[in-house]
């Protein structure tokens, strides 16, 4: 798969990791999370042109069929390939607890 | 996550498994695959409205941020949650061999 700097649509337009700042209110977490009050959410955003960061054989098939039948088969989509864990200080009935989530922040991205 | 029949956009419009018939030529495989000559490709197609088949916490975050910043953050995307293996009879330098691929056909779908 081609690397993230080799985007045929122009620099930064293809599938890659982006950071979006979000408050607990933005995330709908204010009623059950105490900290952090703001999260630097890493997520996968960008286009998936032909064979760019193709995750697997399925992604390659999808690219081929999208080219043939664009109204029926969508292009591959930019999604997390792996995640970084994140700890939340959660409200409980009796106070607070620390909880680690393994599927919250994208670590790197691919097209599928 | 809600099941595939509970699509708020109407039956069959949300993220689910579809089958697309494709020839070796369609897939660009004719030069290296001998059989099958045609594949029933299963893939994940459809919309991912709020919390529909959300794969994990990241998908839930994405939904929340897409609602707030639709021009910056895309909606979750319908992708394979797991795969069915498939055997190909491949051409080799000396003849043919059987090769099983584990990441070729979608088995079920989720939104991420």
């Amino acid at each position: 798969a081609r690397n993230g700097d080799d985007c045929p649509l122009g620099p930064g337009r293809c599938c890659r990791l982006h950071t979006v700042r979000a408050s607990l209110e933005d995330l709908g977490w204010a009623d059950w999370v105490l900290s952090p009050r703001e999260v630097q959410v890493t997520m996968c955003i960008g286009a998936c042109p032909s064979q760019f960061r193709a995750a697997n054989m399925h992604a390659q098939i999808k690219t081929s069929l999208h080219r043939l039948k664009p109204d029926t088969v969508p292009a591959p989509c930019c999604v997390p390939a792996s995640y970084n864990p994140m700890v939340l200080i959660q409200k409980t009935d009796t106070g607070v607890s620390l909880q680690t989530y393994d599927d919250l922040l994208a670590k790197d991205c691919h097209c599928i | 996550a809600r099941n595939g029949d509970d699509c708020p956009l109407g039956p069959g419009r949300c993220c689910r498994l579809h089958t697309v018939r494709a020839s070796l030529e369609d897939l660009g495989w004719a030069d290296w695959v001998l059989s099958p000559r045609e594949v029933q490709v299963t893939m994940c197609i459809g919309a991912c409205p709020s919390q529909f088949r959300a794969a994990n916490m990241h998908a839930q975050i994405k939904t929340s941020l897409h609602r707030l910043k639709p021009d910056t953050v895309p909606a979750p995307c319908c992708v394979p949650a797991s795969y069915n293996p498939m055997v190909l009879i491949q051409k080799t330098d000396t003849g043919v061999s059987l090769q099983t691929y584990d990441d070729l056909l979608a088995k079920d779908c989720h939104c991420i």
């Epitope: - | 293996p85 498939m86 055997v87 009879i89």
Partner: antibody, heavy 118, light 107 residues
Framework: QVTLKESGPGILQPSQTLSLTCSFS??????????VGWIRQPSGKGLEWLAN???????YYNSALKSRLTISKDTSNNQVFLKISSVDTADTATYYC??????????WGQGTLVTVSS | DIVMTQSQKFMSTSVGDRVSVTCKAS??????VAWYQQKPGQSPKALIY???YRYSGVPDRFTGSGSGTDFTLTISNVQSEDLAEYFC?????????FGSGTKLEIK
């Protein structure tokens, strides 16, 4: 590494039902394109295809024997079964199971000899 | 049913020779024909797929050819371990059928 092994009763009497089991490893019958077939060979004679079953549970039978044949599978235990009802001496043969990929027999078991005798 | 005819029941050859085993189909098979080798006391082994493609691990002295109704398995530089019976099989349509076999004898 693909291996297949047939097992059967060895000997049975005319009019009985022959039950054969093919136990295999090295592939899965949940794989698209994969199947298992049964072939028999009377001593000193040629090969006769009997039946096969595919990953999607499609079943095909030799039309000459169809009314007597039943093929089934247990995907999770890597086994395929063949039953032949109302056997007679003409069913005496070595019975093979074979891994199939898109209609050819890629790997064969060692075979099991079945004798029908009164 | 499709009949696969192997007209030569026996063929005699010497080590180092070249020999051709033929198979004729009763109707057009395109290239949907396979060849198998069965050594004495053993189970059959796949040699050729789709008329001309050697299966992995099969020595390159085995060559398949043909399409339509006429098919040939050629063994060049015959070796003593090639002593076996050779069967063709059609998988163009059900029921799958085999040729009656050709036994290769080494002089």
């Amino acid at each position: 590494q693909v291996t297949l092994k047939e097992s059967g009763p060895g000997i049975l009497q005319p009019s009985q039902t022959l039950s054969l089991t093919c136990s295999f490893s090295g592939f899965s019958l949940s794989t698209y394109g994969m199947g298992v077939g049964w072939i028999r060979q009377p001593s000193g004679k040629g090969l006769e295809w009997l039946a096969n079953i595919w990953w999607n549970d499609d079943k095909y039978y030799n039309s000459a024997l169809k009314s007597r044949l039943t093929i089934s599978k247990d995907t999770s235990n890597n086994q395929v079964f063949l039953k032949i009802s109302s056997v007679d001496t003409a069913d005496t043969a070595t019975y093979y199971c074979a891994q199939m990929a898109y209609s050819w027999f890629a790997y064969w078991g060692q075979g099991t000899l079945v004798t029908v005798s009164s | 049913d499709i009949v696969m005819t192997q007209s030569q029941k026996f063929m005699s050859t010497s080590v180092g020779d070249r020999v051709s085993v033929t198979c004729k189909a009763s109707q057009n098979m395109d290239t949907n024909v396979a060849w198998y080798q069965q050594k004495p006391g053993q189970s059959p082994k796949a040699l050729i797929y789709s008329a001309s493609y050697r299966y992995s691990g099969v020595p390159d002295r085995f060559t398949g050819s043909g399409s339509g109704t006429d098919f040939t398995l050629t063994i060049s530089n015959v070796q003593s371990e090639d002593l076996a019976e050779y069967f063709c099989q059609q998988y163009n349509s059900y029921p799958f059928t085999f040729g009656s076999g050709t036994k290769l004898e080494i002089k």
